[in-house]
Interface confidence: low
């Protein structure tokens, strides 16, 4: 595959009159990455899912959900050509549609699961554009997509690449940050114990200052709950 074909343009815009549906556009045959930001504190401990909706009021049929163990949500889970991964600290759910096809177009939802209920994080309209480098009959893309220029739309450009077979995705920033924080806490705890022993004090009288291990100010490291299936 030539490098040019690995460049994926991702157009994101808010649809007026479509109940805050965010539009993501991808090119047929390439990959499309959909991101759904959310409040990581509000949705702490919850698994996430990606479902396809039949019309605005129709049922939302589950396509793929994050790992059964919430702590392992950063691990990419596949269902066919659709992958899901959750940056639980950063508060970003990412869905990858590999080898995008005309039939992938439609209304979707990013969901946060709790019990048998599901909260909608974002409504997404996936639009599939014909590949300008593919000279097959455009009849394959029989439903119309956006083909005009997007002068009024807020456009984000995203460069993406396909994951090769066996390639291990790099962990999300938040996971690395979490590990770093745990390492720092261990060092500080050891230092505190050492200092307490040195001064003949009981451990814990001078706790280490709070660490900000979140992406935003005010996000403090919380004790992680035990491994559980929420």
């Amino acid at each position: 595959m030539e490098p040019l074909r690995l460049l994926i343009l991702l157009f994101v815009t808010e649809l007026s009159g479509a109940h805050n549906t965010t539009v993501f556009q991808g090119v047929a045959g390439q990959s499309l990455q959909v991101s759904c930001p959310y409040d990581s504190m509000k949705h702490w401990g919850r698994r996430k899912a990606w479902c396809r909706q039949l019309g605005e009021k129709g049922p939302c049929q589950r396509v793929v959900s994050t790992h059964n163990l919430w702590l392992l949500s950063f691990l990419r889970r596949w269902n066919g050509s659709t992958a899901i991964t959750d940056d639980t600290l950063g508060g970003t759910l990412t869905i990858t549609l590999r080898n995008l096809q005309p039939h992938d177009a439609g209304l979707y939802q990013c969901q946060s699961l709790h019990g048998s209920e599901a909260d909608t994080l974002r409504k997404v309209l996936v639009e599939v554009l014909a590949d300008p480098l593919d000279h097959r009959d455009a009849g394959d893309l029989w439903f119309p997509g956006e083909s005009e220029s997007f002068e009024d739309a807020h456009v984000e450009h995203s460069i993406s690449r396909s994951l090769l077979e066996g390639e291990i995705p790099f962990p999300p920033t938040s996971i690395l940050l979490l590990l770093a924080c745990i390492f720092l806490i261990k060092i500080l705890a050891a230092s505190a114990l050492w200092a307490a022993a040195w001064h003949g004090q009981k451990p814990g009288t001078h706790p280490p200052s709070e660490l900000d291990c979140g992406h935003d100010p005010g996000y403090q490291l919380q004790t992680l709950p035990g491994l559980r299936d929420t």
Partner: antibody
Framework: QVQLQESGPGLVKPSQTLSLTCTVS??????????WSWIRQHPGKGLEWIGN???????VYNPSLKSRVTISVDTSKNQFSLKLSSVTAADTAVYYC????????????WGQGTMVTVSS | DIQMTQSPSSLSASVGDRVTITCQAS??????LNWYQQKPGKAPKLLIY???NLETGVPSRFSGSGSGTDFTFTISSLQPEDIATYYC????????FGGGTKVEIK
């Protein structure tokens, strides 16, 4: 509840242009989860898809009719239209407008249809 | 073009009978197939989408199955109000419809 209503002349002369309009009520034509279609049915025969239009104005047509078909949208009037040029008696049919679910081939809401006869 | 061959073209059955209609695609269309019901003088009405999913509000006696090239539409217990013509429609490429099956009551 979205409803569609076709309107236009019931009689068109051969070689002229057939023009029909579909008015959408009970919902916005600009809703991004849908596209808008024209389908026709020859007397006593099956259904034939003519083409689709999206709220943005982008279109796709049946290859067999492509050279003669133009579908347009007027979001301010909540309408979309069909023009079929150089008509012959073979274009005599009931013409339906319908709403499709984007990404699905599902036509979930239909107009009641309008009969168009091509005759001199 | 993908051709959709529907059979039979017409059938007559008694109230309560199980009615089966088949639709064959000229090439593999996965599950990209819908079924519609059209009553005389009316517009078609969606019954089944994606080969086997029942549209909201449609009675459960209607069902669909199949994948690839061969599809089946079934009315488990024919009712008088089911008198209509039934069409299959593929959407693997641009939509094409089957020729229709006219269902009558004996």
């Amino acid at each position: 509840q979205v409803q569609l209503q076709e309107s236009g002349p019931g009689l068109v002369k051969p070689s002229q242009t057939l023009s029909l309009t579909c008015t959408v009520s009970g919902g916005s034509i600009s809703s991004g989860g849908y596209y808008w279609s024209w389908i026709r049915q020859h007397p006593g025969k099956g259904l034939e898809w003519i083409g689709n239009i999206y709220y943005s104005g982008s279109t796709v047509y049946n290859p067999s009719l492509k050279s003669r078909v133009t579908i347009s949208v007027d979001t301010s009037k909540n309408q979309f239209s069909l023009k079929l040029s150089s008509v012959t008696a073979a274009d005599t049919a009931v013409y339906y407008c319908a709403r499709g679910l984007y990404g699905y081939g599902v036509l979930d809401v239909w107009g009641q249809g309008t009969m168009v006869t091509v005759s001199s | 073009d993908i051709q959709m061959t529907q059979s039979p073209s017409s059938l007559s059955a008694s109230v309560g009978d199980r009615v089966t209609i088949t639709c064959q695609a000229s090439q593999d269309i996965s599950n990209y197939l819908n079924w519609y019901q059209q009553k005389p003088g009316k517009a078609p009405k969606l019954l089944i989408y994606d080969a086997s999913n029942l549209e909201t509000g449609v009675p459960s006696r209607f069902s669909g199955s199949g994948s690839g090239t061969d599809f089946t539409f079934t009315i488990s217990s024919l009712q008088p109000e089911d008198i209509a013509t039934y069409y299959c429609q593929q959407f693997d490429t641009y939509p094409t419809f089957g020729g229709g099956t006219k269902v009558e009551i004996k």
